[in-house]
């Protein structure tokens, strides 16, 4: 729970935040996600690092795996087998981009408390998993999948053409990882462990990015990504699935791309198990408007997968790209062939429809002007899901219980009015069979993360409530935070606003507009946060406002496809709109009024601050694209088009930061950027800086020397405190 | 007893127009898809069409959907099949059925009524 | 879908067991029904789901396949077995009916 005002007599015992409190994360908090292995048990890493095994129905836990045995290898992250015959430990982390890292990997056999001897596995490991069934492993190593029937045996290597920077199995390429897939991993195993399925990427024709990573020897290192920007060459992708149990027997088998695919490129998006004999592809045109989902059934005769035209179910836009940020996945039905999955109705808002003989004939199951986020489970009587419908706020999301095994299906909102005040933007986890699950509650209040009962609901018990944080909190002035909209030209503003502990509305004060703005991105919601903005407004007595302009996420199609194939228009225009709407609430000092933002959002302030209004006195950008030419073709391609004459390049030209430099004149900019920026190419912030120069338009800037996107370590203190300094004295507030 | 009474046969003329109906008691009617089902003299059994519980979704057999109209007043507890334009080979036994709603999201037919003779002659 | 069920006649004798087919021209992944008529009756629902029997069906009837291929066997025919048999799918409409089975009395 957010710590209640107190009364003036106290209020000197109250201390504003500090910029160190946000430096050393001394107001943040824990979650707790259960590790299931059953219907009715967990697994958690206690305070003391030992592996505990918690059985919900007895109440009792065992300790399976010591911080003796971890420590032993200085092992970071554990998994057991689904035979609980045996844990992996993984130590040497190793990160590479957003989610892949390699590792090495230690067995340990439970059933004698010893590490497995012989046949150990090669290192650093790319990616390793445990079959879903029994003991079984495999691995990728040197861009090659391996396979092991037990942890102790040789490996079968089930793939040969690996190749640094060139042919990847079983895990993807940069742009795959990044903006596609979303994981470190590019294999499945079926449910019971018979198949396993991966993809395999060939990049060969795709332009490299090549970088210098200075480090401490006399000569600098050149990084070289293949990574495809808008307009490039893609990789090429193909899906194989073999049989785990005679892996020599027939080899790896291609599932074949649907025709309407096929027929011009194309990408995969995503692969779900059904059955151990029947699997479920996505696939997405380039031009991503047309996304088709393909069932496929082994056929035992010709030990082939066959993918008939009849199980092909199309989905496409007609007024954007497929999907949201992604096509949804699908989530399937106890029948093993209809499944229910999240695209937009015929209202235009993101609903879940029941899919049996074909997508036309789609029962909906939920409507209404909100939308529905993620399925979490199925169960034979039960659909569990999120949405953001409870009293209209787009920025909470609630957990959601739908009987389907009778008619008419009944709604339940499980958490709506569980702890009100204090949780309104919720996630959850659910157990095998939807026997119990986790509810982990991220604020607006305080997170609390408490276990249900899966058939009543009921809370069991609390399994972390961040009593440290609350304690810690109790004497500490946070900043007052609203969430509200603004109506305008039928458009709805979402605005968070994070006002001064001590805010009086007659007096006038500094406004830092914190912005994103991406496309399908949300920044305004309701969950607990103790940062840099809080800071600001605690200490030094800004305001700050975030909104959600055109283009983001959850309030339906017309808001969320009205960027489309026009990034860097309306975002900037609502952001300034927004503005405009806080001044005329009358406590806004008009002279002193900022914006910066990360990433997209360091594009958006930056066309914010050369947009020619005169509203900004100055503003950061901190690793932003400049130009869409720079950016990653399946990201970019989604929302703009091609960078063609015959398609979208007019507007890839006019959204640049380049072309406005002139419109710098009149404001403070600050840019940022770090030199091994994998993901936004530093690049960007080059192209900036030579256009201000060739204008002679005077900035600061900063770069972070062999610092990737997400400028972390001491690059993240030094990062704050510039910003910090520069806001500061843009606002002229005293240090 | 669930039970379903269809009414409304007889003798039409060609080109002619007849409603059927189908009054269902001892169940919760307002829950349960309905269809109808058509079975010519010595022949086998035709599905016609379905409408679910609250007739946002009806379904028709191709052949007939231009000419036949199924409708149902769930205060009456009443099923419909408007007849229209009808032709020598409508002759038949037409047979109204309930279903049990079926996980997931499908329906059986349980309960059939003892059908009503429409005989098409000039 | 057309379903196409054979023998389209059958006779047996009490105690015999018979087996029914139903083919459909594509794949309706058991969303497949049984149904029982006897001489002047409304049809009555064996099976349903390729194999799950009906409330109050009598365990000698048995539904199963898979895919294209269904069959409905009636273990130790019953003198009260006799009747016109039905398949029918549930895939995606039209719901059709197969052609029918009259199993009579050798």
């Known amino acids: 729970l957010r710590p209640s005002r107190v009364h003036n007599s106290e209020e000197n015992t109250m201390r504003a935040l500090t910029l160190k409190d946000i430096l050393n994360g001394t107001f943040s908090y824990k979650t707790f996600f259960p590790n299931w292995i059953s219907g009715q048990e967990y697994l958690h890493q206690s305070a003391d690092n030992n592996i505990v095994l918690y059985n919900i129905e007895t109440g009792q836990s065992y300790t399976i795996l010591s911080n003796r045995t971890m420590k032993s290898v200085n092992a970071s992250n554990y998994g057991l087998s689904p035979d609980r015959q045996f844990v992996y430990l993984e130590s040497d982390y190793s990160k590479l981009w957003r989610y892949s890292y390699t590792a090495t990997y230690y067995i340990y056999d439970l059933s004698n408390g010893e590490f497995v001897r012989g046949n150990e596995l090669p290192r650093p490991i790319q990616y390793l998993c445990w079959s879903p069934v029994g003991s079984k492993l495999a691995y990728v190593y040197q861009n090659n999948i391996y396979l092991k029937q037990r942890p102790g045996d040789p490996p079968f290597q089930i793939t040969f053409n690996g190749r640094e920077n060139k042919i990847f199995n079983g895990i993807p390429d940069w742009v795959y990882e990044e903006e596609m897939l979303a994981t470190k991993y590019a294999l499945w195993w079926s449910p019971n462990g018979k198949f396993l399925a991966y993809a395999e990427f060939n990049d060969t024709d795709i332009p490299v990015i090549a970088y210098s990573y200075y480090g401490d020897e006399q000569y600098p290192r050149t990084i070289n990504i293949p990574y495809p920007k808008a307009g490039a060459k893609n990789p090429v992708v193909r899906i194989f699935i073999i049989d785990t149990t005679y892996p020599a027997y027939v080899g790896p088998q291609e599932v074949p791309v649907p025709a309407m695919i096929a027929s011009s490129d194309y990408y995969f998006s995503w692969l779900t198990w059904v059955t151990d004999e029947r699997v479920c592809l996505q696939w997405l045109k380039r031009v991503q408007n047309v996304s088709v989902l393909s069932i496929c059934d082994f056929r035992e005769d010709w030990q082939t997968w066959d993918c008939p035209k009849t199980q092909e179910h199309i989905e496409e836009s007609r007024t954007g790209w497929a999907g949201g940020f992604f096509v949804s996945t699908p989530v399937f039905s106890y029948d093993a062939i209809s499944y229910y999955k999240i695209f937009s109705d015929k209202d235009g808002y993101k609903h879940i429809h029941y899919i049996k003989d074909t997508v036309e004939n789609a029962i909906q199951i939920t409507s209404g002007k909100w939308e529905a986020i993620n399925i979490f489970r199925v169960t034979q009587d039960s659909l569990f899901y999120s949405s953001n419908e409870f009293e209209e706020y787009p920025g909470r999301r609630n957990i959601y219980r739908i009987s389907i095994g009778s008619y008419p299906p009944s709604k339940k909102c499980v958490t709506c009015h569980l702890r009100k005040e204090r949780c309104q933007y919720y996630t959850a986890s659910f157990s095998d069979y939807a026997k119990y699950y986790a509810l982990v509650c991220y604020g607006p209040g305080i997170p609390i993360s408490t276990l249900h009962d899966g058939r009543t609901d009921q809370e069991i018990k609390i399994l972390e409530e961040n009593k440290e944080l609350e304690n810690a909190l109790k004497n500490i002035q946070l900043p007052k935070e609203e969430i509200k909209k603004l109506e305008v030209d039928e458009i709805t503003l979402w605005y968070k606003m994070i006002l001064p502990p001590q805010f009086d509305r007659s007096k006038k004060y500094p406004l830092l507009i914190q912005v994103y703005g991406g496309p399908c991105s949300q920044s305004v919601r309701s969950v607990f946060a103790v940062n840099w903005i809080s800071y600001l407004a605690s200490k030094e007595g800004m305001v700050i406002a975030l909104v959600d302009g055109r283009g983001t996420a959850f309030q339906g199609d017309k808001l969320l496809y009205a960027v489309y194939r026009k990034l860097g228009v309306y975002e900037v225009e609502d952001q300034i709109t927004a503005v405009r709407k806080f001044i005329e609430m009358g406590f806004i000092d008009e002279k002193r009024i900022a914006i910066w933002g990360w990433s997209y959002g360091g594009y958006v302030s930056s066309l914010a601050l050369a947009s020619g209004t005169g509203l900004f006195k100055c503003g950061i950008a901190v690793a932003p694209v400049s130009s869409w030419e720079y950016y990653a073709s399946v990201y970019t391609e989604r929302f703009m088009g091609l960078p063609t004459k015959d398609d979208n390049l007019e507007h890839y030209k006019n959204s640049t930061v380049m072309a406005r430099a002139e419109y710098f004149r009149n404001v403070d900019y600050l840019l940022i950027h770090g030199t091994a920026d994998d993901n936004v190419h530093f690049q960007n912030s080059a192209q900036i800086a030579k256009a201000l120069v060739n204008a002679q338009v005077d900035f600061q800037a900063m770069w972070y020397s062999d610092q990737n996107h997400g400028l972390s370590g001491l690059s993240t203190n030094h990062l704050y405190t510039h910003m910090t300094h520069f806001l500061k004295q843009c606002f002229s507030l005293s240090d | 007893e669930v039970q379903l009474l269809e009414s409304g046969g007889g003798l039409v003329q060609p080109g002619g127009s007849l409603k059927l109906s189908c009054a269902a008691s001892?169940?919760?009617?307002?829950?349960?898809?309905m269809s109808w089902v058509r079975q010519a003299p010595g022949k086998g059994l035709e599905w016609i069409g379905e409408i679910n519980p609250d007739s946002s979704t009806i379904n028709y057999t191709p052949s007939l959907k231009d000419k036949f109209i199924i409708s149902r007043d769930n205060a009456k507890n009443t099923l419909y099949l408007q007849m229209n334009k009808v032709r020598s080979d409508d002759t038949a036994l037409y047979y109204c059925a309930g279903g049990y709603y079926r996980y997931p999201y499908y329906y059986t037919m349980d309960y059939w009524g003892q059908g009503t003779t429409v005989t098409v002659s000039s | 879908l057309v379903m196409t069920q054979s023998p389209s006649s059958l006779s047996a004798s009490v105690g015999e067991t018979v087996t029914i087919t139903c083919r459909a021209s594509g794949n309706i992944h058991n969303y497949l029904a049984w149904y029982q008529q006897k001489q002047g009756k409304s049809p009555q629902l064996l099976v349903y789901n390729a194999k799950t029997l009906a409330d109050g069906v009598p365990s000698r009837f048995s539904g199963s396949g898979s895919g294209t291929q269904y069959s409905l066997k009636i273990n130790s025919l019953q003198p009260e077995d006799f009747g016109s048999y039905y398949c029918q799918h549930f895939w995606s409409t039209p719901y059709t009916f197969g052609g029918g089975t009259k199993l009579e009395i050798k």
């Open positions: 001892g169940f919760d009617f307002s829950t349960y898809w």
